[in-house]
């Protein structure tokens, strides 16, 4: 369960891939599209509001006999819109929604090498936001093999 309904902290940051491509958001036909692209030098990076929540895992669920906490995040590039996992389509979409946000809008935060982070779907453990064909997609990751795979690594810049 997510502890409380308020985030423990929030920050505005731009989101880029391991290979320094920018994640951008564009309003098209009354809906937002998400792009992964090389930005021209003078173009300002889009900022995302990251809201961080603590999720309490009782020892009965954690499997190691210890109560644990996870850091979960929601990502909002513009007012009232949040990134959401569409597990059926293996896609990442921007949806307008009201609070309380659906579980599909929450991602477990993982720290990685090279000062990168990864975002794991709360609703589908082992599935991460990743880059596929210059778009964001949901990518299934084999824990034993691929946690360092570059296509699920992202950089946050305040």
């Amino acid at each position: 369960s997510i502890t409380g309904i308020s985030p423990i902290t929030e920050s505005l940051a731009s989101l880029s891939t391991y290979n320094d491509q920018s994640i951008t958001f564009a309003l098209e036909d009354e809906s937002y599209e998400i792009y992964v692209e090389d930005l021209k030098k003078d173009k300002k990076k889009d900022k995302v509001l990251l809201s961080y929540y603590e999720s309490q895992h009782p020892s009965s669920e954690s499997g190691d006999g210890v109560d644990g906490k996870m850091l979960m995040v929601t990502l909002s590039p513009t007012k009232d819109f949040w990134l959401q996992a569409n597990n059926k389509e293996h896609s990442v979409e921007l949806h307008k929604c009201e609070k309380p946000l659906p579980d599909q809008a929450f991602f477990v935060l993982h720290n990685r090498s090279f000062n990168c982070v990864s975002f794991e779907c709360k609703t589908d453990p082992g599935v991460f936001i990743g880059v596929k064909d210059n778009h964001l997609a949901l990518i299934k990751v084999d824990y034993s093999e691929n946690l360092g795979s570059e296509n699920i690594l992202f950089k946050l810049s305040e």
Partner: antibody, heavy 121, light 107 residues
Framework: QVQLQESGPGLVKPSETLSLTCTVS????????VHWIRQPPGKGLEWIGV???????SYNSALMSRVTISEDISKSQVSLKLSSVTAADTAVYYC???????????????WGQGTLVTVSS | DIQMTQSPSSLSASVGDRVTITCLAS??????LAWYQQKPGKSPKLLIY???RLADGVPSRFSGSGSGTDFTLTISSLQPEDFATYYC?????????FGQGTKVEIK
Amino acid sequence: QVQLQESGPGLVKPSETLSLTCTVSGFSLSKYGVHWIRQPPGKGLEWIGVLRAGGTISYNSALMSRVTISEDISKSQVSLKLSSVTAADTAVYYCARDHYYYSSFGGFASWGQGTLVTVSS
Amino acid sequence: DIQMTQSPSSLSASVGDRVTITCLASQTIATWLAWYQQKPGKSPKLLIYAATRLADGVPSRFSGSGSGTDFTLTISSLQPEDFATYYCQQLYNTPYTFGQGTKVEIK
């Protein structure tokens, strides 16, 4: 109950390799990152590196050419090796566990008691 | 690397005093800052994480504030067991650097 215990030789000769083991219990290395930190006598804390949940490793660039961190999940152990040691590597060495599953953003919630390693001939 | 500068490096205070320690980061670290207490011969103990969150079992007289580059640890009413050295640490980027420490001594 969460526990971390450092072990290894208390005395290492200059130019040799310092080897320490952190044995953990009460939590899973597949969920939590384990860090190595050192503290020279009477001085402050220096972060050495981390073995993250999932097995990726990050090192302090100031030590990267000399340091290796590895794990043996079956024994619930994380190892530290520091090569070509000098007197400047004399310190209390600690291992510590992340506060959060999968993330270091919440700091280090549990620490071992530390082990003093002296580098001297 | 991100440099963390703590001030003061030491202070003398009496039981019941309000004590404030500051930590300055060389670049923004959002709110990814932790405070630790260390007593002689002991391991550091996590007091505050995410700049403002009280760790489990830590008395409410300890509080943290700040974001970006400027952070503060406050002890509202110093108790005899609070005489120790306090360290800040940034967790925004590796290497996860510590401040040089603030020793709180009995006046």
